[in-house]
Interface confidence: medium
């Protein structure tokens, strides 16, 4: 079970990292800035 939990967490982490990488590529420094609105 602990292996499953670790794998699931790592999978989520990998997805989060992929999203961050995508955002950084598309947005550059904007990704870290305050100029964003809903």
């Amino acid at each position: 079970h602990s292996d499953g939990i670790f794998t699931d967490s790592y999978s989520r982490y990998r997805k989060q990292m992929a999203v961050k990488k995508y955002l950084a590529a598309v947005l550059g420094k904007r990704y870290k800035q305050r100029v964003k609105n809903k």
Epitope: L23, L27, G28, K29, R30, K32, R34, V35, N37, K38
Partner: antibody, heavy 127, light 114 residues
Framework: QSLEESGGGLVQPGASLTLTCTAS?????????MCWVRQAPGKGLEWIAC????????TYYASWAKGRFTISKTSSTTVTLHVTSLTAADTATYFC????????????????????WGPGTLVTVSS | DVVMTQTPSPVSAAVGGTVTINCRAS??????LAWYQQKPGQPPKLLMS???TLESGVPSRFKGSGSGTEFTLTISDLECADAATYYC????????????????FGGGTEVVVK
Amino acid sequence: QSLEESGGGLVQPGASLTLTCTASGFSFSSNYYMCWVRQAPGKGLEWIACIFTGSSGSTYYASWAKGRFTISKTSSTTVTLHVTSLTAADTATYFCARDRALSVVGYFYAAYYFDFWGPGTLVTVSS
Amino acid sequence: DVVMTQTPSPVSAAVGGTVTINCRASEDIESFLAWYQQKPGQPPKLLMSRTSTLESGVPSRFKGSGSGTEFTLTISDLECADAATYYCQCTDGSSSSSSYGWDAFGGGTEVVVK
């Protein structure tokens, strides 16, 4: 789609002025950053301020423009720039410009470039 | 804040020739660069964004290249209508919390067509 500025002219030093930008062919119900940029005679482009046209209405100013310049959205097709304590250094053509914004994962980020510009309105500050 | 420096100005070439305009950023801005054309008495016109992506209606004679800190706008098969001042603008935003990305324009390069 077009933008048009109005309100420029000859003004006395120390006076205040309100410039208006009117959009045609599109409305601010879409999410943009509407901005003001000025250009002194024979000089380069100088960004002044932007406002997000969505519900937040967030405003952004160049560091030198804070306090004396105020940008506002006054209707679904108009944005104004109010300027106080005008000096000769404010003599310039004032352009209204649209930042089309980047829609990414539910947020509208500034594109940081301007895809539509108005023809400009000349403000001359002189006694 | 990012500082954009353009060279040379003015630059001239004959009709049918080629001109190259350089734009240098004071820090790495990846490919986040836009180019504008401004003719006397007119507002600037966006030519391209993201270094090389042409806006609709802009002829393919206009070509943008570069990345990082060094960028180039090349205009080939020059026409009289290309006589204008060209501005680059960093579109990467600002790494400073006290400024924004809209204010990073180059000083402009005048193109004279002979």
